[in-house]
């Protein structure tokens, strides 16, 4: 049978080759008649066998961490017969461990965040090193952790690598710490290998600082011309905390005049002093207010740091501004009848200088040929007005300070031109009428209507009549419909185209104005040769052709 002991070969041997052990058959009497052979992965490259003796050698440096076990096969042949002396056998060569690997922190970089002011014993982070050596081979992979840097604020548990706080820390003094942890194998004994890692420990902020004003007194100025909502200046408090813990709210603590407000710019953490009501230098030229500042978020357990809010005094000086003239009214509406003579009085506007010096005022009208204004603000006409051309005038009146012509104010002035009855009614359109030669008496020739350019206070009412001469000898008559229309009717039977081809009828139209106005309007009536149906259409057609230069048969 085969004879061998268990085979071990140390890793990382520096020798060119290493005797591992001997394989032999118990039938081998040492006369060199047997030949030993090695087969399997590593045979001939990692391990060789002395064919005569069965001695096995490792011919290359081995690394247990790469491969810890080789399974090989052995054969032994009788040289004289060429036959196997023993059945082929499998055997194992184990690579024994040496402490050739230092502990390594595979999860680095390490970074941890812990709240400032955390009590002693607070867990920060656990660091873990790995050692590639054999954990079952002595202490080659048994690790001990120690702190190389980080005392007195931190400690590390030797066997677990758990880092804890050992002293309270204030982020406002130092916000991060570099801790260096060493891991040693061989449980720290001589010949141990070591590895280190750095842990960045950042302190997160807690709200242990209240905001405090940078200044105990702020001096601000505001122009009396500033509109409400104007930002007149900023005040600033500082808070040693950061982020949400440094967010602050500013507010007014004292402002008897209730003229100012403070809003908080949450981006810059500044307090913005805002004008709540307009100020007037001539009325009050300085103010004093008190502001306070508090954190936006305060945890109950941190209230002890936030007793008594920080306050500051703000002195606000009002700056005098040369203000433009001020009209008594924001706008004026005046009325004047049309047809009044040039130079007629329209109305009076009035503006004053609101400043203390009370500059005299000059007035002017922007782009107007119809009105004039004097230095007293009296508006007069420069022309007679016609309501039927323009019923309203929109004027822009400008007041200018005599002492400072750049100080100007303008207001609108509306002038309504009032109606007088200065227009008689007229035909609403040009009428051309036709009558057949064979027309009977009482036949309607034309319906007419009238218009009046005057404005009617209630409603226009027109009265229609024939002129006196037409009434006495007319072939036609008129009926007033009492609805501002009238009809023209024939007053006889039969007309003669050859004798009287055209009639001109004078129609009087009167309005209901005071005094009443009457106009004379002429209606032209053509006599036509009509067909049996009595239609004037052909007559109208013939008229059209003649007017266009055609002759009809």
């Amino acid at each position: 049978g085969w004879v061998w002991n268990q085979f071990f070969v140390p890793e990382e041997m520096n020798t060119t080759s290493h005797h591992v052990g001997r394989l032999r058959s118990d039938l081998d009497n040492g006369n060199n008649s047997f030949q030993y052979k090695l087969l399997g992965a590593g045979a001939g490259s990692t391990f060789i066998i002395d064919e005569r003796t069965g001695d096995i050698y490792a011919i290359e440096k081995l690394d247990r961490e790469e491969r810890s076990l080789y399974i090989l096969r052995a054969q032994v042949i009788d040289i004289t017969t060429g036959r196997a002396v023993e059945p082929e056998s499998e055997f194992v060569i184990k690579v024994s461990d040496i402490n050739d690997n230092e502990p390594k922190f595979l999860d680095e970089p390490y970074e941890a965040i812990v709240p400032e002011m955390s009590p002693e014993g607070t867990l920060v982070i656990q660091v873990t090193a790995s050692d590639a050596d054999d954990p079952s081979s002595g202490n080659n992979a048994r690790l001990l952790y120690s702190l190389l840097q980080g005392q007195p604020y931190f400690s590390v548990e030797p066997t677990t690598g758990v880092i804890r706080i050992s002293s309270k820390m204030d982020r406002e003094l130092q916000d991060e710490y570099w801790v260096i942890i060493q891991a040693k194998d061989m449980i720290g004994q001589p010949g141990a290998l070591s590895g280190t890692t750095s842990v960045l420990i950042k302190l997160s902020d807690v709200n242990d600082n209240k905001p405090i004003f940078k200044e105990s007194l702020y001096r601000l100025t505001v122009s009396e011309s500033a509109p409400t909502g104007t930002s007149i200046g900023t005040i600033m408090a500082y808070d040693n905390d950061i982020g949400e813990n440094a967010e602050m709210d500013y507010s007014i603590e004292e402002d008897d005049s209730q003229t100012f407000d403070i809003i908080t710019n949450h981006e810059t953490q500044e307090g913005i002093v805002i004008l709540k009501k307009k100020v007037n230098f001539e009325h009050q030229n300085h103010y004093g207010i008190r502001a306070k500042v508090k954190n936006h978020h305060v945890d109950k357990q941190l209230m002890k740091y936030h007793t008594e809010a920080s306050t500051t005094f703000i002195k606000i000086q009002v700056e005098d501004v040369d203000e433009p003239p001020l009209f008594l009214l924001p706008y004026y509406i005046f009325e004047i009848f049309e047809e009044t003579p040039q130079g007629s009085f329209v109305g009076v506007v009035s503006a004053t200088d609101p400043d203390n010096r009370k500059s005299p005022i000059r007035y002017s009208i922007t782009r107007s040929k119809v009105f004039n204004i004097d230095d007293n603000g009296t508006i007069t006409t420069t022309n007679s007005l016609d309501r039927e051309i323009s019923a309203w005038y929109n004027l822009s009146i400008t007041a200018t300070e005599k002492y400072n012509i750049e100080q100007i104010s303008s207001i609108p002035v509306y002038v309504q031109v009032l109606n007088i009855n200065d227009h008689a009614p007229e035909f609403s359109q040009y009428y051309e009428s036709y009558v057949c030669e064979n027309a009977g008496s009482g036949q309607v020739i034309q319906t007419i209507s009238a218009v009046d350019r005057d404005e009617s206070i209630e409603e226009h009412h027109f009265y229609f009549n024939l002129s006196v001469e037409d009434t006495n000898s007319s072939s036609f008559t008129i009926i007033d419909n009492q609805d501002n229309t009238a009809v023209i009717l024939t007053n006889r039977t039969g007309f003669n185209l050859q004798e009287e081809p055209i009639f001109y009828i004078s129609i009087l139209i009167a309005d209901n104005g005071i005094p009443s106005l009457t106009s004379t309007n002429t209606l032209t009536i053509h006599v036509c040769d009509c067909d049996d149906s009595g239609s004037t259409q052909t007559c109208q057609y013939q008229e059209l052709m003649l007017s266009m230069g055609f002759k009809t048969e």
Epitope: T15, S17, I48, I59
Partner: antibody, heavy 121, light 107 residues
């Protein structure tokens, strides 16, 4: 009978290249380590390089590392030495030598007669 | 690297005399030492390996001894064919290194 026959030597300029061969016979080539050893004129022996049987492992003297490459072709039972960036100090007779058995695996039990390499401008 | 130091550099002896050649290693190389003989114009020839094992065909008058750092090659009775240069070589560590050689000449 084990025999080793070197070839490929010659005169080469500094910076040049040469490839030496060593034809082996009389033994199972793939079962033995093979070596190159050189001897400068009038000097002692200097080991150059070794390759294990089958070519899995190669080793070099510091003086040639990065410039010389040892290799073998088991099918031809031939050992090679590719020499690049040659220097005057590389001038020598280059011998190939067969490794031994067992504990003398990386030994030199049979030597070839050598081939001469001259590096000169 | 292991430095091999041979002494003496030259050994002048007569035929039939005993030759004792020394080889020292700069650190222990166990028994992984070989001795070679080289004659002018010839390739080296293996004499001893494993510090004391004679190679095939080497006569019994040639013997080796020692281990660790101190080694000796002994030729008990010099023959004419023994006059040559002798090199020791360690094969325990990379790089393999040779001694500077000892020349055995006829007195």
């Amino acid at each position: 009978e084990v025999q080793l026959l070197e070839s490929g030597g010659g005169l080469v300029q500094p910076g040049g290249s040469l490839r030496l061969s060593c034809a082996a016979s009389g033994f199972t080539f793939s079962s033995y380590a093979m070596n190159w050893v050189r001897q400068a004129p009038g000097k002692g022996l200097e080991w150059v390089s070794t390759i294990s049987g089958g070519g899995a492992n190669t080793y070099y003297a510091d003086s040639v590392k990065g410039r010389f490459t040892i290799s073998s072709d088991n099918s031809k039972s031939t050992l090679y030495l590719q020499m690049n960036s040659l220097r005057a100090a590389d001038t020598a007779v280059y011998h190939c030598a067969k490794g031994g058995m067992g504990g003398y695996y990386y030994g030199m039990d049979v030597w070839g007669q050598g081939t001469t390499v001259t590096v000169s401008s | 690297e292991i430095v091999m130091t041979q002494s003496p550099v030259t050994l002048s002896l007569s035929l039939g005399e005993r030759a004792t050649l020394s080889c020292r290693a700069s650190q222990s190389i166990s028994s992984n030492l070989a001795w070679f003989q080289q004659k002018p114009g010839q390739a080296p020839r293996l004499l001893i390996y494993g510090a004391f094992t004679r190679a095939t065909g080497i006569p019994a008058r040639v013997s080796g001894s020692g281990s660790g750092t101190e080694f000796t090659l002994t030729i008990s009775s010099l023959q004419s064919e023994d006059f040559a240069v002798y090199y020791c070589q360690q094969y325990n560590y990379w790089p393999l290194t040779f001694g500077g050689g000892t020349k055995v000449e006829i007195k």
